[in-house]
Each structure stands twice: as structure tokens, then as C-alpha cells.
Amino acid sequence: IWELKKDVYVVELDWYPDAPGEMVVLTCDTPEEDGITWTLDQSSEVLGSGKTLTIQVKEFGDAGQYTCHKGGEVLSHSLLLLHKKEDGIWSTDILKDQKEPKNKTFLRCEAKNYSGRFTCWWLTTISTDLTFSVKSSRGSSDPQGVTCGAATLSAERVRGDNKEYEYSVECQEDSACPAAEESLPIEVMVDAVHKLKYENYTSSFFIRDIIKPDPPKNLQLKPLKNSRQVEVSWEYPDTWSTPHSYFSLTFCVQVQGKSKREKKDRVFTDKTSATVICRKNASISVRAQDRYYSSSWSEWASVPCS
Amino acid sequence: RNLPVATPDPGMFPCLHHSQNLLRAVSNMLQKARQTLEFYPCTSEEIDHEDITKDKTSTVEACLPLELTKNESCLNSRETSFITNGSCLASRKTSFMMALCLSSIYEDLKMYQVEFKTMNAKLLMDPKRQIFLDQNMLAVIDELMQALNFNSETVPQKSSLEEPDFYKTKIKLCILLHAFRIRAVTIDRVMSYLNAS
């Protein structure tokens, strides 16, 4: 058993049918010595008396808010949560496996640049009685500071019969140098509590591996005289690290017909312009990627050919 | 249709082309190592990230773009000094910091070159003959060093008398390639920045 926060405790249980559970001793936070009784949640049934209460915690029915009273007055509370260990592996009931980029990916994180700022998000089908708390650091043995905000509900989607809820959090490394070569990964830890169930999820990454630039901005077409060709031009996104000559991007320019089945023409360039043939009803899209370290491509920025 | 990116013309900052080749070569070598050594811990998540140049060179600090010198977090240690007679210095107006930067890059390359050559000698003794260092990568390191053209003492190749532990050697190769790829990215960024300046 360990303390999650004041008056909230997590009991770790080896979770299998007929498991013996864990013996837990609760102590009433009071100078009083006698006349103390204990109850669980809203029930008025007295579970025991005395300054301490010993209970055998086996299942969720044994978890909850234990309260010690004296003469009708509440003295203190202890909330017991359960953390299930199933065959040596902590349960992951609360969050959905996003399966991207690999199986057992519960937290996904992205950064728009090398400033040390990043966003993480996760999915759940649970809509109520759910709380998250997020901590982060650079490295784990001698952790350096990363400050995270509060997790917020960022999207709701309908998936088949289920509703899916997306939560996200923004974090910022306290002293980040965009040019630094990372040798210690960023660690992100999310505590999730659903009713009386506690779970924790972690992710470990280097900022360089989670970079996803914003799409190029100011995408424009300039028709070339007496030709079906156009000059496409764009600019680096505002959110990208500067100077751009050091933090360079490479671009992919795509000409896509109206039908998805039509052949796509693609050109790769390090410049911020390209000459392409503009077909009728086609659209031109441009996306960006770090020129020297192949992390994710940005989303496409698009303009119609007409 | 994939159109290749145009290679820089010879009039450009002379080292840019070499640094791009270096990054390509080390990335290819790392990919080959990951595939060949699939039963070894060779992914970024599994290895310890060690920098053999730590406390010996200070490339990141010495090569910091001017725009980032205002960032307190980027100014940890900028005290290391180096010899300053490189041929990549495009004009006489080149600052002392640029000379320091290029000289630091040269020292990095020299250290990695020695490590890789020592490691290759060990790998050649492996009866499994599982993996060797790409000669192209070693050649590209050499070319960039020549382009930088710094005079410095030659570091003798380390020779080891004891029987090599091939498992450890292959894990060390992965560690070295990951670190060298990160340094090659920094070198490429620096050359791109200097070229634009």
C-alpha cells in the first residue's frame, strides 16, 4: 500500500480468482483514543471500533472511503483505491490501446518544434468518475524538470456503438535548448483513476523522435506564361524552430486529381517553391519534415489548381 | 514520381555536400545494423545513449547559431578551444567561433573514425561474420575530415590484446552508430547554417 496523495491510498493486488488479497491497517488521524467507530462509503454499518481498523482487501467491494467517527462526528477519511496486477502485468483497463506506432501504445506525444514543448494525448471509452494527473521529467535517475498542465477533454468521437473520449495535456521542459543533442529521454507518467481503480501509464521518448511540424503556410500558386505549369510557393510554419537555416525542413509537393484513384505526382525539394503541372480539378498539397532527422511529416497544406 | 533533391553546386560552402553524404551514410549503416542485429538490443529505446566526445569536444555549444546564444539553456559550457586553420573557412572574416566550431567537428570525426576502425578490426575476427562497417561510411568521414583540413595529432588506433567479446562489440556498435547519427545531424545543421550565412 502507498499514498497517492493526502488521505488517498493505493493497494496493489495480485488479481486472480480466490486470491488472498492484502491485509491493510488503517489508522484514524485523531488524538482521540476510544469511542472510535469505522464505516465504509455511505453505509452506516459499523465495520470495527478502535483507533486502527484491520481489513483484508481482495476485491473492489473492499475499496472505497473508510471513515472513522466519534459520537456522530467525522474524525478522518482514508480512500482506498485498487491497482490490479494480472500475472505480473499491471492492468490497463482505463485507456485504449492506440496501436500506433506499435501495440500497447496508450499515450501518444508530439512536438511542433525543438523548444521542449510537447503535447500528449490518450483515449478512453469511460465518460464519468474519471480523473487524470500527469507528471514528466527528463531522465529518471536524476530527473530534470518538465512542467505539465492539467489534462483536459480535447475531443469526443463516436466509434461504432461506443463513444470515445480524447484527453490531452501540454508539457514544457523547464530549461530546453533547441540545438541540444538529447541523451536522456523525456518520461511522461499519467495516473488514471476510474471510480476505485487506479492505473498508471508511462511513455518515454526523445523530442527529436516525436517532432511533427505544422503544415507549411501561405501556400500560393503562380501560373507560368504559355504553360500548363505553375510555380507553387510556401513558407515555413510559424511554429517551427528558428533559425530556419539551422533547423531546415524538406518538403513534399503532391498534385492529386479529384479522384483518389488518379496517379499522384510527387516532388521532393528543400526549397520553398517548386514548379509542377496543374491538371484541371486537381489540387496541390505540400507537407514538411525535418530535413536531417526523419521524424513525422506534417499534415498537408492544400490549394485547388483552378 | 520521386524527383531527387538537387546536389549543391561546387561554389557552395565546401563542407555542406560532404556533411550531407555523412548523414546519409551513417543513417544507412544504422538501418543495416538494426536489421542485421535484430536479436540484439539495437533500437533507440533499448540502448544506452553514450557520447564518446563528451567532455572532449563541445560541438553543440561551439557551433550554436547566433540566434540561440541568447538562450540561457544553450550556454552550458563554451570554454573548450581548438586549433583554427581549416579550409572550410570560406572567407577571412570568419569569426573565431566559427573556427572553433569547425575544429570541434573535426575532432568529433577523428574520435569516431578511430572507434569505428578499432571496432571493425574486432568484427572482422568474428567467426559469424555477421556485420562489418560500411567502407563508404568510413570513406565519407575521411572526405569530410580532409575538407575541414585541420592539422591535429593522429590518434593511434586502439589495439586490444584480450579476446573480443563479439556480443558486447555489436552492442557497442549500435550505441556508437546511434550517437554518431545524432552528431551527424548536428553537423549537417551547422553546415547548412554556415552556408546560409
Epitope: Y16, P17, E86, I89, N103, K104 | -
Partner: antibody, heavy 115, light 112 residues
Framework: QVQLVQSGGGVVQPGRSLRLSCAAS????????MHWVRQAPGKGLEWVAF????????YYADSVKGRFTISRDNSKNTLYLQMKSLRAEDTAVYYC????????WGQGTMVTVSS | SYVLTQPPSVSGTPGQRVTISCSGG????????VKWYQQLPGTAPKLLIY???QRPSGVPDRFSGSKSGTSASLAITGVQAEDEADYYC????????????FGTGTKVTVLG
């Protein structure tokens, strides 16, 4: 006393369907994940499928994906395996089992797919 | 489809020490716990070892399990006639958990 009692096995022709049941008692069935495991005659153990305690997630071996469906009725304390498009290679003793460091197995039920 | 490899058979005379190996990889035994089962003919498997080296109550202490790196082993010190059975190791793969990975199985024969 944890008990898993299986039923539903038998002889079936290729291409036909069969449903296996596993009745649980002696524990809070709705709190635990459950597996199906099979063993072809003279062969080793092969995992077939898993269902979470609340039925929210189901996992299948590639060999049965799209043909077998694992389900549970927590109000009846029963686990099911619906088997469709059966093949000769599905012939085996099928076991249900609880998930956890200590596990309990059903007695097994024989499924024979033969024309 | 088995990724946990066991020797097909091992044998010993009563009182001898018999060991069965179970070889896997970094993504299964290397990152997860191992169980061992004993299966007598015509019966369901019986749990012998869980969490690599733990014995459930009721299992004789002549059975012991261990794990090192990407391999695990089961030892029977002082093998007895009633130990003649099939033995299976079981683990998980970190990418496909909770799918169970079983070993190929080992037939233990007690001679004499």
C-alpha cells in the same frame, strides 16, 4: 472453491458451427479476464482467445480470427466460444481458463471436425 | 508458430535432477514473466510455477523455476515416477499481450 465446467463439444462437419460454454462458480466472474486454449490430439497447447472482465476487449489467435467469437454473460457467470466455418485443423480439446498469476482450468471439451 | 522453444524430451532416473529449458526473445521472456505447467495424460494442465520462480501452495518443493535474460528453466530435483508428464512453459509477448505464448512442450520420462 473456484470451478469451471465446460460443455458444448462434439462431432461436427467441416464448414459448420458449434458453441462451447464454460460455467463459472466460486468467484466473482465479472471481475476477471478469461481465455480459451486448445490442444490438438498429440500436440501442444495453443492459445485461442481472450476476453476482458467486462467484455470490452477481445483478442484472437490469427488461426481463428474472423471465424471464432469469444463472449461472456456476466449475469449468468458464463463464458462462450462461438466457432464458425470449422476446419479439420480445429479438432482439439478446448479448455477455458481464468487470467492471472494463479489460474484455474476447465475440464476440457473435445471438438472433432470431420466429414 | 511457437516462439518459446523447449527440448522435445528429457529423461532421468528416480532421484536425479532434471532440467527443462525454455528459450524465447527480448519481447517475450525478456520482458515478461514465465509460468510452468505439468500435464498428465487426459487431464487439464496444472500450474507448477508462476511469476518465474514462485510455487503455488500444494506444489512439491522439488519443482523450482528460474529466469535469466531471454530464457527460463524448470528444475525437478529428485525426480519421481509420478513426475512423468508433459511440461509447458508460458509467457507473453509485449506486443500481443494478453495472448498466451506457450512453449513447444517437453516430455519428461522417468527411467527404471
Amino acid at each position: 472453491q473456484v470451478q469451471l465446467v465446460q460443455s458444448g463439444g462434439g462431432v461436427v462437419q467441416p464448414g459448420r458451427s458449434l458453441r462451447l460454454s464454460c460455467a463459472a462458480s466460486g468467484f466473482t466472474f465479472s471481475s476477471y479476464g478469461m481465455h480459451w486454449v486448445r490442444q490438438a490430439p498429440g500436440k501442444g497447447l495453443e492459445w485461442v482467445a481472450f476476453i476482458r472482465y467486462d467484455g470490452s476487449n477481445k483478442y484472437y489467435a490469427d488461426s481463428v480470427k474472423g471465424r471464432f467469437t469469444i463472449s461472456r454473460d456476466n449475469s449468468k457467470n458464463t463464458l462462450y466460444l462461438q466457432m464458425k466455418s470449422l476446419r479439420a485443423e480445429d479438432t482439439a480439446v478446448y479448455y477455458c481458463k481464468t487470467h492471472g498469476s494463479h489460474d484455474n482450468w476447465g475440464q476440457g471439451t473435445m471438438v472433432t471436425v470431420s466429414s | 508458430s511457437y516462439v518459446l522453444t523447449q527440448p522435445p524430451s528429457v529423461s532421468g532416473t528416480p532421484g536425479q535432477r532434471v532440467t527443462i529449458s525454455c528459450s524465447g526473445g527480448r519481447s517475450n521472456i525478456g520482458s515478461n514473466t514465465v509460468k510452468w505447467y505439468q500435464q498428465l495424460p487426459g487431464t487439464a494442465p496444472k500450474l507448477l510455477i508462476y511469476l518465474n520462480d514462485q510455487r503455488p501452495s500444494g506444489v512439491p518443493d522439488r519443482f523450482s523455476g528460474s529466469k535469466s535474460g531471454t530464457s527460463a528453466s524448470l528444475a525437478i530435483t529428485g525426480v519421481q515416477a509420478e513426475d512423468e508428464a508433459d511440461y509447458y512453459c508460458q509467457s507473453y509477448d509485449r506486443g500481443t499481450h494478453p495472448a498466451l505464448l506457450f512453449g513447444t512442450g517437453t516430455k519428461v520420462t522417468v527411467l527404471g
